[in-house]
Interface confidence: low
Amino acid sequence: KEEQISFRDCAEVFKSGHTTNGVYTLTLPNSTEEVKAYCDMEAGGGGWTIIQRREDGSVDFQRTWKEYKVGFGNPSGEYWLGNEFVSQLTNQQRYVLKIHLKDWEGNEAYSLYEHFYLSSEELNYRIHLKGLTGTAGKISSISQPGNDFSTKDADNDKCICKCSQMLTGGWWFDACGPSNLNGMYYPQRQNTNKFNGIKWYYWKGSGYSLKGTTMMIRPADF
């Protein structure tokens, strides 16, 4: 009987010889739980596991804690891979995080963090980031030090308000902070002066809602 080959991330998929972009099944070591993730095998050398994508407003990102924990959406389109999987993955080895952004005028930019991991659910999937480079701002639009994750039903932010309810979407809100890539999707020409849109402050300012975003991770030693 042929042995079932499993991959923990898209870097392992890439190294096994699968170098085509697409949806692949990933499994954490010592686990039988599978997730479907989109692998970008072309950008910057390939091997990127996409953990978030916004592109057309086809998926509702105003979801519960549990939905953000397990993931939702369509890996071929808009989706969130799942905090639990990402937390476990990024605590097994060192990962980099690349955030790719598109505006409505045809411009693209990115932020690259040389070390990224999420704490466990007990610690509210707090985000940890180090070493920012890239073209989407010299200051991190994800508040540093990292914050706990908040959703519409889990208010873990540092504001007396409820950032997730006010700004929509689950995110590592501060009070409420300079970013929210899971905010409301606004179409072109409706995308300015929007406090609850898809925001990356240190690239486009506070009221600009982006056309597209991708969050991707890859082992630092890839």
């Epitope: 057309d56 407003g57 086809s58 998926v59 509702d60 990102f61 808009e78 409301m184 999707y185 179409p187 072109q188 020409r189 409706q190 300015t192 002066n193 056309k211």
Partner: antibody, heavy 117, light 107 residues
Framework: EVQLVESGGGLVKPGGSLRLSCAAS????????MNWVRQAPGKGLEWVAE??????????HYAESVKGRFTISRDVSKNTVYLQMNSLKTEDTAVYYC????????WGQGTLVTVSS | DIQMTQSPSSLSASVGDRVTITCKAS??????VAWYQQKPGKAPKLLIY???TRHTGVPSRFSGSGSGTDFTLTISSLQPEDFATYYC?????????FGGGTKVEIK
């Protein structure tokens, strides 16, 4: 090239129904809220209805004059937006234009709806 | 509902003239105002949005200004192809509303 092509207009008696269609091409239809705007003969422009995206639960808005009689819908798989018009009145006589997100950059050529006995 | 009161309802001008059309909103609409041009038998065309941003391909002789309740469309030097009807629109709140239109005719 962006194209919005309306169809379904025609002559209908008061109290009757019509369904207008608008086929979209040349842009990412799923990215855009879609609207209907009408223009009575020799008159100005009047906004009729809007439908948003799937992520907005296809939320709709209507002008007071058509609320409860008209229904806007969209089929993303067909890149088409519809306007179901029931209980039509003579004052609904107009050219009906399909447009994109306000402010309206993309317009169809219009389809004439005549409500007359 | 927000009323958009446009003036004048019509005007006569010559090629090369500077033309100004005003639009007054019944309540504050910020800068969520657009201007359209419409020729007989044709669909309207977007000229200006966000009160002052020219849409792609619109000649620089068209400009918009204003915020809050008072808005202006200016054609700096009227060209033969500019004879048409112009509408303002607010998209700040529902229902979306248009001004009554300004017909620009040849003097």
């Amino acid at each position: 090239e962006v194209q919005l092509v309306e169809s379904g207009g025609g002559l209908v008696k008061p109290g009757g129904s019509l369904r207008l269609s608008c086929a979209a091409s040349g842009f990412t239809f799923s990215n855009y809220w879609m609207n209907w705007v009408r223009q009575a003969p020799g008159k100005g422009l009047e906004w009729v209805a809007e439908i948003r995206l799937k992520s907005n639960n296809y939320a709709t808005h209507y002008a007071e004059s058509v609320k409860g009689r008209f229904t806007i819908s969209r089929d993303v798989s067909k890149n088409t937006v519809y306007l179901q018009m029931n209980s039509l009145k003579t004052e609904d006589t107009a050219v009906y234009y399909c447009t994109d997100t306000a402010p309206f950059a993309y317009w169809g050529q219009g389809t004439l709806v005549t409500v007359s006995s | 509902d927000i009323q958009m009161t446009q003036s004048p309802s019509s005007l006569s001008a010559s090629v090369g003239d500077r033309v100004t059309i005003t639009c007054k909103a019944s309540q504050d609409v910020g800068t969520d105002v657009a201007w359209y041009q419409q020729k007989p038998g044709k669909a309207p065309k977007l000229l200006i949005y966000w009160a002052s941003t020219r849409h792609t391909g619109v000649p620089s002789r068209f400009s918009g200004s204003g915020s809050g309740t008072d808005f202006t469309l200016t054609i700096s030097s009227l060209q033969p192809e500019d004879f048409a009807t112009y509408y303002c629109q607010q998209y700040s709140s529902y229902p979306l509303t248009f001004g009554g239109g300004t017909k620009v005719e040849i003097k």
